[in-house]
């Protein structure tokens, strides 16, 4: 998988009035990075590693880069002509990747009121429209407004690519990211299913990378796919990954399955409990909402994209 | 523990202009952060005025964008509120407190009387 | 600027009893509002952050509640000791405004 730096931003309107904040995540490889904390007014690293990238380097140029892209936000759905009564958001999120082959991609993308209207190649600076006439006037209207903001130049654009894979290079240069594993903590539930047969589950959660292998094994040999259920590796908050790996088994052949993991070039089996162990998956499943972003945007239903 | 202390001259004349020191203690006012002063005038009624953020930049009220400036000392960790062209209207109890959206930490207040 | 309105500026209650506090803002604030405690000859104090968020060292008998444009500070089981003016405070954008405040006395 490549390396990746991504911006999401967020600024929010009422009756035309724009907010003074603005909400703002940065995500690197995947993993929460860092926010704008409002309070503080600050760029805050999320979690110790987060904070072992920079080492005891300051935030200040994050910050001061999430305090000028969150100002140009602002203005920009400020210029949104068509906005309505109620509650509005605009949502910016810019990516940049480094490929295994050391090629690179950047490319942003904004949102009004959760639906995507412009995206732009930052490296060739191609813009897409997508074909509904909201998007496209939505679009017009935008663009046209970045062409009139003087800072909003060709020159610009190739910054903020340049920018981008600039701090993405300057964070993978501390090592953290690379040299960074966190091994899985791996549990296994059995539950009742149908007569004579019940469902076991092998849950692998706090890991890092999020690449790994998780199946279930019969005497030592891996079940076909289709008789096994995955679910999406998923971040859970921490900086960390949780996945799950489900198959039904005769009621008495427990100890011919185990659950085989395989992480970080680490390997484990895991064998089924003895004894009734009720368990609710649905819960672990579906416990992946928006990373801990701030909660506003579950209070009010604004849709934050991945 | 974070303590926040106002100063000031208690009385001024109508006219004059108004200075007033909040001393931050255990706490760094360059850290993060934005400093506050929010007065309360006689019947209760509470104003934000402005603030000083850590890293030096302001944000005033426009009621008193004219007449209002925050500064600050960082070798003494200390912020400042001028306010020119002061008026009886003025007489109000100053806080200085600290945060960039609500405020967590309060000084006890200064009184000041704007009377001729 | 946005207004806060707290409709009810006297409340008197018994003691033991549960008091809701009223706070309406002229436009939506998406849950950016703060609840302070003053009493007399002291400084405000935060109770509450982000509409429901309880401050530490803060009593759980408090609590914050509301969106949009309307919001509640909730006392169960009053004591002595939180009798005392309590305002809101918004933070949508500046200039950051206060409620008129709600003073709390015991019936």
């Known amino acids: 998988e490549p390396h990746s730096l991504r911006y999401n931003l967020t600024v929010l309107s009422w009756d035309g009035s724009v907010q003074s904040g603005f909400l703002a995540e940065v995500h690197l490889d995947g993993q929460p990075f860092l926010r704008y904390d409002r309070q503080k007014c600050r760029a805050k690293p999320q979690g110790q590693w987060a904070e072992d990238v920079l080492g005891n380097k300051t935030w200040d140029r994050e910050t001061r880069d999430l305090t000028g892209n969150g100002k140009d936000l602002r203005m920009t759905l400020a210029h949104i002509k068509d906005q309505k009564e109620g509650l509005h958001s605009l949502q910016e999120i810019r990516v940049c990747e480094i490929h295994e082959d050391n090629s690179t991609r950047s490319s942003q993308h904004f949102y009004y009121d959760g639906e995507l209207f412009l995206s732009q190649n930052l490296e060739t600076e191609e813009w897409t429209v997508p074909q509904s006439s909201r998007a496209q006037t939505l679009a017009m209207n935008v663009r046209n407004f970045l062409k009139e903001d003087a800072m909003k130049t060709k020159t610009h654009y190739h910054a903020m690519h340049a920018d981008c894979l600039q701090e993405l290079r300057r964070y993978l240069e501390s090592g953290v990211v690379l040299r960074r594993t966190v091994p899985p903590m791996v549990n296994v539930t059995r539950s009742e299913a149908s007569e004579g047969n019940i469902t076991v589950t092998c849950r692998a959660s706090s890991f890092y990378p999020r690449n790994i292998i998780l199946t279930w094994r019969q005497d030592g040999v891996s079940l076909s796919h289709d008789t096994q259920q995955w679910g999406d590796v998923l971040p859970d908050g921490n900086g960390t990954y949780q996945t799950w790996v489900a198959t039904r088994i005769c009621r008495g052949e427990e100890q011919r399955f185990t659950c085989y993991m395989e992480h970080s070039g680490n390997h484990s089996t895991h064998p089924v409990p003895s004894g009734k162990v009720l368990v609710l998956q649905s819960h672990w499943q579906h416990h992946h909402h928006h990373h801990g972003l701030n909660d506003i945007f579950e209070a009010q239903k604004i849709e934050w994209h991945e | 523990e974070v303590q926040l202390e106002e100063s000031g001259p208690g009385l001024v004349k109508p006219s004059q202009s108004l200075s007033l020191t909040c001393t931050v203690t255990g706490y760094s006012i360059t850290s993060d952060y934005a400093w506050n002063w929010i007065r309360q005038f006689p019947g209760n009624k509470l104003e934000w005025m402005g603030y000083?953020?850590?890293?030096?930049?302001?944000n005033y009220n426009p009621s008193l964008k004219s007449r209002i400036s925050i500064t600050r000392d960082t070798s003494k960790n200390q912020f400042f509120l001028q306010l020119n062209s002061v008026i009886t209207e003025d007489t109000a109890t100053y806080y200085c407190?600290?945060?960039?959206?609500?405020?967590?930490?309060w000084g006890q207040g200064t009184t000041l009387t704007v009377s001729s | 600027d946005i207004v806060l309105t707290q409709t009810t500026s006297y409340l008197s209650v018994s003691l033991g009893g549960r008091v809701t506090i009223a706070c309406k803002a002229s436009?939506?604030?998406?849950?950016?509002l703060a609840w302070y405690q003053q009493k007399p000859g002291n400084a405000p104090r935060l109770l509450i952050s982000d509409a429901t968020s309880l401050e530490t060292g803060v009593p759980s008998r408090f609590s914050g509640s509301g969106s949009g444009k309307d919001y509640t500070l909730s006392i169960t089981s009053l004591q002595t000791e939180d009798v005392a003016t309590y305002y809101c405070?918004?933070?949508?954008?500046?200039?950051?405004?206060f409620g008129g405040g709600t003073k709390l006395e015991i019936k």
């Open positions: 405070q918004h933070y949508w954008s500046t200039p950051w405004t």
């Open positions: 407190a600290r945060g960039g959206t609500y405020f967590d930490y």
């Open positions: 436009a939506h604030i998406n849950n950016w």
């Open positions: 000083i953020s850590y890293s030096g930049s302001t």
